[in-house]
């Protein structure tokens, strides 16, 4: 067992080294480890094959370090890995698209608060078991087409607190099991009418605190399971172009937030849902 760590066998074979001031992944981690806790240290680099000997590893926590680089082969051989927490490593900024390849059992991936500016092509390729993907509080500006296409079992996708300015047509392709999509506190000004086409099981959609002045109801039509919708804190324009959204909200049987109008001035601060159809005039 490495000097700064505590190792024990019950309930799972565990190597625990949190908040020890470690500057590198310690050598001598027992090969039988099923759980490795390295969070809260000063680790800046995860070299290739750092955990290759740990074939039984199911949980790896590296959050709250100072990671600036993760080698593309850092997690090679971890075919049984289920939880990987890399959150709160603000200097990371980018992740090689091959980093997570081969992690076919991974069900939870934390990449929140990592300073990520983009999601490279194929970053999540092959992660068929993934259920929870945390990407909030980064610096993402765009959602490239088909980024999440292989994630057919994903249920939770957290993208809030980024700089995303639009939701393109193919951003969420393949997310047939998605239950919760959190897109609030971004800069979204435009949602493609077909952006949510595959999200027939979505129950929760947060789009509040964005830059939406309108939302095509065609985008909401596929959301047959939707129960919770938050649209507040957007600069909604409540003129005749808002009538389709107003009509959709009247029929919506789930729980929706207020939809406060910003324009025209006479309707500012009033809830679109509570307006009468003839309030929505002039284009």
């Amino acid at each position: 067992c490495p000097g700064a760590c505590v190792c024990y066998n019950e309930p799972k074979v565990t190597t625990s080294c949190p908040q020890q001031g470690l500057q590198a992944v310690p050598v001598g981690i027992p090969a039988a480890s099923q759980r490795i806790f390295l969070h809260g240290n000063r680790i800046s680099h995860v070299p290739a094959a750092s955990f290759r000997a740990c074939r039984n590893l199911t949980i790896l926590w590296l959050h709250s370090n100072v990671l600036a680089r993760i080698d593309a082969a850092a997690f090679t051989g971890l075919a049984l890995l289920e939880q990987l927490d890399l959150s709160d490593n603000a200097q990371l900024r980018s992740v090689d698209p091959a980093t997570f390849h081969g992690l076919g059992r991974l069900h939870t991936l934390h990449l929140d608060r990592c300073g990520l500016q983009e999601l490279g092509p194929g970053l999540f390729r092959g992660l068929a078991a993934l259920q929870y993907l945390y990407l909030q509080d980064n610096a993402l500006q765009a959602l490239p087409d088909d980024t999440f296409r292989d994630l057919g079992n994903l249920t939770h996708l957290f993208l809030h607190g980024n700089r995303i300015s639009s939701v393109p047509e193919r951003a969420f392709r393949g997310l047939h099991s998605l239950d919760r999509l959190l897109l609030h506190q971004n800069r979204v000004a435009h949602v493609h009418p077909h952006a949510f086409r595959d999200l027939g099981r979505l129950m929760t959609l947060y789009l509040f605190a964005n830059n939406l002045s309108a939302l095509p109801t065609e985008a909401l039509a596929p959301l047959r399971a939707l129960q919770y919708l938050r649209l507040n804190d957007n600069p909604w324009v409540c003129d005749c172009r808002a009538r389709p959204l107003w009509a959709w909200l009247q029929k919506f049987r789930g729980s929706s937030s207020e939809v406060p109008c910003s324009l025209p001035q006479r309707l500012a601060g009033r809830d679109l849902k509570r307006l009468a159809a003839n309030d929505l005039q002039g284009c």
């Epitope: 809030h160 605190a209 804190d233 600069p235 937030s257 406060p260 601060g269």
Partner: antibody, heavy 127, light 110 residues
Framework: QVQLQQSGPGLVRPSQTLSLACTVS??????????WTWIRQHPGKGLEWIGY???????YYNPSFMNRVAISIDSSKNQFSLNLSSVTAADTAVYYC???????????????????WGQGTLVTVSS | QAVLTQPSSASGTPGQRVSISCSGS????????VNWYQQLPGTAPKLLIY???QRPSGVPDRFSGSKSGTSASLAISGLQSEDEADYYC???????????FGPGTKVTVL
């Protein structure tokens, strides 16, 4: 540490407009995702939520105030304001400004709370 | 008329445990987090408990919050004379799209 300082007249004539300002110190009013909120309390009674304006400048008002209320934000002065028009004696109350913080939990649940609060301004509507 | 329901008063002797209930519905307490505010005489309300059971720094650990279904409660264990105040529960209401409060409970230290 953020502090809120209220200012405005304590006496307003019926049918006139009540105007109060809340100056934020300790941070920029435009930083973060907050909801700058006004709440009032009738003498000896409970609290009533009036509305908010977000750091992005989007207002939302309690429907019970109909079209009488307007909340605005002035980043250059680091303050936000409440205007309540066509006041009557029923609008006599202590008015508080406060900041709503929102936090998203790991489960995607939104947690929101009001903190800090201004000192309160007793506004009497009387001729 | 307050949307949430609280007892108008509660009392106890120093050191005692006092509990205040707050009852609502599925559209407020049932689906959102509950906060508690303390208002000492002649002062502005102060955040006491947020997110159901979290205490801001500076709030003594004798204050605790809990929630079950459409009801919440605030417990004060080891009541002290400085706890004499009005206590308000609050939650967002998804039907009204408003922040709603209880009418307040006046706690008296005997």
């Amino acid at each position: 540490q953020v502090q809120l300082q209220q200012s405005g007249p304590g006496l307003v004539r019926p049918s006139q407009t009540l105007s109060l300002a809340c100056t934020v110190s300790g941070d920029s009013i435009s930083s973060g995702d907050y909801y700058w909120t006004w709440i009032r309390q009738h003498p000896g009674k409970g609290l009533e939520w009036i509305g908010y304006i977000s750091t992005r400048g989007s207002p939302y008002y309690n429907p019970s105030f109909m079209n009488r209320v307007a909340i605005s934000i002035d980043s250059s002065k680091n303050q936000f304001s409440l205007n309540l028009s066509s006041v009557t004696a029923a609008d006599t109350a202590v008015y508080y400004c406060t900041r709503e913080t929102q936090h998203t939990s790991i489960f995607g649940v939104i947690h929101n709370w009001l903190d800090p609060w201004g000192q309160g301004t007793l506004v009497t509507v009387s001729s | 008329q307050a949307v949430l329901t609280q007892p108008s008063s509660a009392s106890g002797t120093p050191g005692q445990r006092v509990s205040i209930s707050c009852s609502g519905s599925s559209s407020n307490i049932g689906s959102n987090t509950v906060n508690w505010y303390q208002q000492l005489p002649g002062t502005a309300p102060k955040l006491l408990i947020y997110s159901g059971n979290q205490r801001p720094s500076g709030v003594p650990d004798r204050f605790s919050g809990s929630k079950s279904g459409t009801s919440a409660s605030l417990a004060i264990s080891g009541l002290q004379s400085e706890d004499e105040a009005d206590y308000y529960c609050a939650a967002w209401d998804d039907s009204l799209n408003n922040l709603v409060f209880g009418p307040g409970t006046k706690v008296t230290v005997l």
